[in-house]
């Protein structure tokens, strides 16, 4: 990125000239390349700092900025210098500093293993119906049924590899088309992006590390959307990655591969296979309607097994219905016909917490769930602790210069690039884009990433994600081959071209403003974050989902009302921000609107009330529970018994939110609220944790 | 030792009724399924039709419904064949016999045979 | 129905020859064919089924072959016990249906 212009000699007067900024205020630009700037969150919003009047940069550029809170912060380093200590006290540091490692990367292990976990955890509460909704044999015939039960099934079972192996495996039994296979494809990616999002919740504690890590979190969501939402009407108007992927797979001979390495897998499998073990296949098996599988439990009991071909004696209803001609007969009675038949001896049980337990998948499910994201919670508060004391003073500079700064003109539209590939290559490794961009989030919230820069990285890991998937399907049987194949090609083919949409123009990145838009206004109003995830990953799917299986007229009825408002809204928007003269001047703002639905804070109100029933007794108990009553109410009075908050309600005492110029939101009403021009809501009933 | 006995000969009157058994012993009844089969003229055979004891199923061959009924009893394990508006062309020696049920192992035990003459 | 066929009303033999006896089925059984023997004032008694299995207690010299529509029963060494009539039948599909039978005499 180009640095923001300044004039080299010219020196800041030392009585601070300060004024109220009259109008609105120009986008800062990201300035963290260059500077590391204090977060100052207590800074008042709204003013801007003026040059002396010698300075001939303030007659030709515009006020300096605003105190961006997209700005990295500087992590402050309290400690002795290295200089400055006696031999035990460097051998001290020494170990101090292989303690933090080896805390580091334990609490890494176990929120990768947590990660896991949730998976199986969701796997169980929604398997069977994520199952069931790939029976749905409307999915043929409407992409966009596709397109949200691919977002479903990835959200119920929290894994895109686990919903894409379930398509590839109705496509090689003819269940489905590759074609009908794209859609859900296209929605499986939408919702594996949700685990980094539930990551970015948990530190909702401080305000402007939640702004970043949200918003670093949701880049990946406003990706996946608008690629679809460009994407999936192309695909349905004219094939292109069906033909491309069919043209590849057609001209190539491929012969089995070996199996995708498992890296990470390697080391937490022995862990992770001690909680809990499930039965994969039995999803797979609801999806291509197999009756006896909805009976059937997902936590696997038994891992050794002996199996036994045999023949049995069916009847069958005519003889035409026989499996082998010459097997065929009849006693007069019945037609009958020789099945073979796979019996399995149970020799050995697995060796996990719930293989004796006999508990329903569902209770089985919800523990795991609460448990995995207690530990997914613990592990990123100490993974952030950690990683704040050792990146201080001159660490942090080194790792965020190398991360964050550009390669040298002319060179530095390469730099993305690079992180592209390093996003890939690290999810390759990984074996899993959740993980990485999981991985990411508090590395973003912490500071240390700019959003800037982990966009390229999100890209990258999506890509990552698909060669994984290549790898996979080179590795299957012959009659899955070909499908798998195709169908891992479609979700590369659609995430490059994703990649050419949203971001070779820095003009066209509109995932980051779109997410740092979500990051002003969820760090504003927290609620609001955990109202986005579930609004973006079950409502509106499940509402489309609904709608399709009323029908098409139905689906169009309501769609096209839904879709022209929102057309107009936008267009409304751009006219207002571009040229408000050609609007008559009522429609030059959104002031005609009622207060609810131009701003959130009425919403907030309600949901404070909402709230409060829980505020008096809902979390007393420890630092994690703090948390989540923050990102619920809004409300350090909840917190009184528990002096994490109490000390933290202190420090926040009189703190609003900066924020960027308006231009990041679509509703300019929301964007005055969160800079503060609109009256904020009494600061007694804001709380921030941890 | 597996037995299939059937009961002595029938004279019979045109337009009557005749009811032949078959008691069996020596195997499980209900895992089995009884045939009848007649034989005229002392050469052709020709199945009349079958019943699975267990579930009381029955088939029959097109030309002998409504002319054969064949019924089972578990609790004698004797099954029985009714031959009804007897004709003397139904005059002929008919035979009960097993059927492993869900095998292919075909007729592997008869009963020694009922004569039955029609004649006015 | 499936008619079966055998074309042979009557098969001269002496003791200790090989004899074969056949059966056409008038469509495909695929191997769904018993062999029956009856003496004269007996039950009939099986002696092959699904075409080439021997039934428990059979001599080894009846040996049955064939599957689709030609079948045959076979028995070498011929013993004076075994001048009998020999039924085929069908048991691919209902009704069950005989052939008409194949007397074997001494010549």
């Known amino acids: 990125m180009a640095p923001w212009p300044e004039l080299g000699d010219a020196q800041p007067n030392p009585d601070k000239y300060l004024e109220g900024a009259a109008g609105q205020q120009p986008t800062a630009p990201d300035k963290s390349k260059e500077t590391n700037k204090t977060d100052n969150t207590e800074a008042p919003v709204t003013k801007i700092e003026l040059l002396p009047s010698y300075s001939t940069a303030t007659l030709i550029d515009e006020p300096t900025e605003v105190d961006d809170p997209w700005n990295l912060p500087t992590l402050q380093d309290s400690g002795i210098k290295w200089s400055e200590r006696d031999t035990k006290g460097k051998i001290l540091c020494f170990f101090q500093g292989i303690g933090r490692l080896i805390l580091l990367l334990g609490f890494l292990y176990f929120f990768v293993c947590s990660l896991d976990i949730l998976s199986s955890a969701f796997q169980l509460v929604g398997g069977k119906m994520a199952g069931q909704f790939f029976s749905n044999s409307s999915i043929m015939s409407n992409p966009l049924l596709g397109l949200v039960i691919g977002v479903l099934v990835t959200v119920l079972v929290q894994s895109s590899s686990t919903s894409t192996s379930i398509v590839v495996s109705m496509v090689s039994s003819s269940l489905l088309t590759v074609r009908a296979a794209i859609p859900i494809i296209m929605g499986a990616n939408i919702g594996t992006s949700i685990t980094n999002t539930i990551v970015a919740l948990m530190q909702v504690g401080d305000r402007s590390e939640f702004r970043r890590a949200f918003a670093g979190a949701t880049v990946h969501d406003f990706f996946n959307w608008l690629s679809v939402l460009v994407l999936l009407p192309v695909e349905v108007a004219t094939h292109y990655l069906e033909i491309i992927t069919q043209l590849i797979v057609e001209s190539f001979h491929f012969k089995n591969g070996e199996d995708a390495p498992d890296l990470l897998k390697v080391i937490t499998k022995p862990f992770t296979k001690l909680i809990v073990q499930l039965d994969k296949k039995v999803i797979s098996q609801i999806a291509m309607n197999d009756e006896k599988a909805k009976n059937k439990s997902l936590v696997k009991i038994w891992c050794k097994t002996f199996t036994n071909k045999t023949q049995i004696n069916v009847t069958v209803p005519s003889t035409a219905n026989c499996t082998s001609p010459s097997l065929c007969w009849t006693d007069g009675i019945q037609n009958w016909t020789m099945k073979n038949v796979t019996y399995k001896e149970n020799i050995a049980k697995c060796q996990h917490i719930f293989v004796n337990f006999h508990l329903p998948d569902l209770a089985v499910g919800t523990i795991l769930l609460i448990l995995s994201l207690l530990v997914l919670c613990g592990c990123l508060i100490m993974i952030v602790k950690i990683l704040g004391s050792v990146l201080k003073g001159q660490v942090a500079t080194v790792i965020k210069k190398t991360i964050n700064t550009d390669f040298p003109f002319p060179f530095a539209w390469l730099t993305g690039y690079l992180a592209i590939l390093v996003g890939a290559g690290m999810t390759f490794i990984v074996q899993s884009s959740s993980v990485f961009t999981s991985a990411l989030t508090p590395l973003i919230g912490i500071g240390v990433i700019t959003i800037e820069r982990a966009y390229p990285l999100t890209l990258g890991s999506n890509i990552g994600t698909t060669t994984t998937a290549i790898l996979a399907a080179l590795a299957s049987p012959g009659n899955a081959l070909r499908s798998s194949l195709q169908i891992a090609l479609c979700h590369f083919f659609f995430n490059i071209s994703g990649i050419l949409l949203w971001y070779p123009i820095p003009f066209t990145r509109l995932p980051i403003r779109m997410a740092k838009g979500l990051g002003n206004i969820s760090a504003k109003y927290r609620w609001f974050a955990v109202f986005y995830l579930i609004i973006f990953f079950f409502l509106i799917p499940l509402t489309v989902f609904g709608l399709s299986l009323a029908g098409w007229r139905v689906l169009v009825g309501v769609g096209v009302p839904v879709v022209f408002i929102i057309i107009l809204v936008l267009c409304l928007r751009l006219l207002q921000s571009r040229c408000p003269r050609v609007l008559p001047k009522k429609l030059q703002n959104w002031n005609f609107l009622p207060l609810w639905m131009r701003s959130l804070k009425p919403w907030d109100a309600v949901v404070s009330k909402f709230t409060g029933c829980f505020q008096m007794r809902c979390c007393c108990c420890c630092r994690v529970c703090c948390r989540a009553c923050c990102l619920l109410c809004d409300c350090p009075k909840c917190c009184r018994c528990s002096k994490c908050c109490e000390d933290l309600e202190e420090a926040q005492e009189g703190q609003d939110v900066p924020v960027k110029a308006p231009e990041t939101f679509d509703n300019i009403t929301i964007s005055r609220e969160a800079q503060g021009e609109v009256p904020a809501s009494d600061s007694k009933t804001e709380c921030t944790a941890l | 030792e597996v037995q299939l006995q059937q009961s002595g000969p029938e004279l019979v009157k045109p337009g009557t009724s005749v009811k032949i058994s078959c008691k069996t012993s020596?195997?499980?009844?209900?895992?089995?399924?009884i045939h009848w089969v007649k034989q005229s003229h002392g050469r052709s055979l020709e199945w009349i039709g079958g019943?699975?004891?267990?579930?009381?199923?029955?088939n029959y061959k097109q030309n002998f419904r409504g002319k054969a009924a064949l019924t089972a009893d578990k609790s004698s394990n004797t099954a029985y064949m009714e031959l009804r508006s007897l004709t003397s062309e139904d005059s002929a020696v008919y035979y009960c016999a097993r059927w492993r049920n869900a095998y292919y192992s075909a007729m592997d035990s008869w009963g020694q045979g009922t004569s039955v003459t029609v004649s006015s | 129905d499936i008619v079966v066929t055998q074309s042979h009303k009557f098969m001269s033999t002496s003791l200790g020859d090989r004899v074969s006896i056949t059966c056409t089925a008038s469509q495909d059984v695929g191997t769904a064919v018993a062999w029956y023997q009856q003496k004269p004032g007996h039950s009939p008694k099986l002696l092959i089924y699904w075409a080439s299995t021997r039934h428990t207690g059979v001599p080894e010299r009846f040996t049955g072959s064939g599957s689709g529509t030609d079948f045959t029963l076979t028995i070498t060494n011929v013993q004076s016990e075994d001048l009998a009539d020999y039924f085929c039948q069908q048991y691919r599909t209902s009704p069950l249906t005989f052939g008409v039978g194949t007397k074997l005499e001494l010549k």
């Open positions: 019943i699975i004891p267990n579930n009381d199923v029955t």
């Open positions: 020596g195997f499980f009844f209900t895992e089995y399924i």
